[in-house]
Amino acid sequence: AILGRSETQECLFFNANWEKDRTNQTGVEPCYGDKDKRRHCFATWKNISGSIEIVKQGCWLDDINCYDRTDCVEKKDSPEVYFCCCEGNMCNEKFSYFPEMEVTQPTSNPVTPKPPYYN
């Protein structure tokens, strides 16, 4: 293990298509993987007319884009499907949207999880 980084051992799990995929809808997912690989948590969601619809949450594969990110933040400008990843147990419980734009004051749209998505 590399010192100074948080080991991801479990992540919040959510699947909007749980009936179709025949999985649980929510829970905690243990993150397995090869010993030489880093593990991450992720969240994927959509913004439908200002309403946040979570698509999936869970463990994510070793991904340099997720290294040393303690917070789950999407930085792409207005994607159709939002994605963020992070390191640390359950770090995907909360996720945010902070688009990187060429303006002095970037707008922020922090996402606060609400039922029915979370227990």
């Epitope: 699947n15 298509n17 179709k20 995929d21 025949r22 999985t23 997912e29 397995y32 993987g33 090869d34 992720f42 994927t44 999936k56 869970g58 463990c59 994510w60 594969l61 991904d63 340099i64 884009n65 994607p79 159709e80 499907v81 939002y82 994605f83």
Partner: antibody
């Protein structure tokens, strides 16, 4: 070293059955989701079925739903595909492949494949 | 089902060339996109996962880019062992679906 070894392929008549096996070694089998992917002669890749690490969740392509059943025995480090009511269009090389999670299904290790031929 | 469209279906290139293969999804799949290499008579091999991450043991001349619906696999300097068929695959939604493949041949 991760190894996946398929077996059970062969020639079968339309309407017949086959059971494919995939023996896994070199990793903790019970930690990983597994999938079957097939490739008809001269064609591209087609996902067939997937199963999560403990066998609790399974998923199938529409083309095989109701005819094929995926299962696993973690005590034997083995993945199975029971194929019933086989059709000519099921003729293909069948690969088993490892996946880390249900939702980030990059198939990082594949077996060498086993050929299934459905013909009268 | 999500449709994956690859282009071109085949291309001819020389050793040392820069090669680019594109893959388009019928709907946004965020970064749930993987690339595989397959040589005749062999099993596919994972090259790129999560759109941009290099799989273990894959040379750094391979790279992936894109997000949403449009993705690219680039080989910066084609080597003799790179002549093969390449497939993209989405893992955003079940069923998992593959592109039709791009055959990279020797010019």
């Amino acid at each position: 070293e991760v190894q996946l070894l398929e077996s059970g392929g062969g020639l079968v008549q339309p309407g017949g059955s086959l059971r494919l096996s995939c023996a896994a070694s070199g990793f903790t089998f019970s930690d990983y989701g597994m999938n079957w992917v097939r490739q008809a002669p001269g064609k591209g890749l087609e996902w067939v079925s997937g199963i999560n690490y403990n066998g609790g969740y399974t998923s199938y392509a529409d083309s095989v739903k109701g005819r094929f059943t995926i299962s696993r025995d973690n005590s034997k480090n083995t993945l199975y595909l029971q194929m019933n009511s086989l059709r000519a269009e099921d003729t293909a090389v069948y690969y088993c492949a490892r996946a880390a999670n249900w939702h980030d299904t990059a198939l990082d290790y594949w077996g060498q494949g086993t050929l299934v031929t459905v013909s009268s | 089902d999500i449709q994956m469209t690859q282009s071109p279906s085949s291309l001819s290139a020389s050793v040392g060339d820069r090669v680019t293969i594109t893959c388009r999804a019928s709907q946004s799949i965020s970064r749930y996109l993987n690339w595989y290499q397959q040589k005749p008579g062999k099993a596919p091999k994972l090259v790129i996962y999560a759109a941009t991450s290099l799989a273990s043991g894959v040379p750094s001349r391979f790279s992936g880019s894109g997000s949403g619906t449009d993705f690219t696999l680039t080989i910066s300097s084609l080597q003799p062992e790179d002549f093969a068929t390449y497939y993209c695959q989405q893992s955003y939604d079940n069923p998992l679906t593959f592109g039709g493949g791009t055959k990279v041949e020797i010019k």
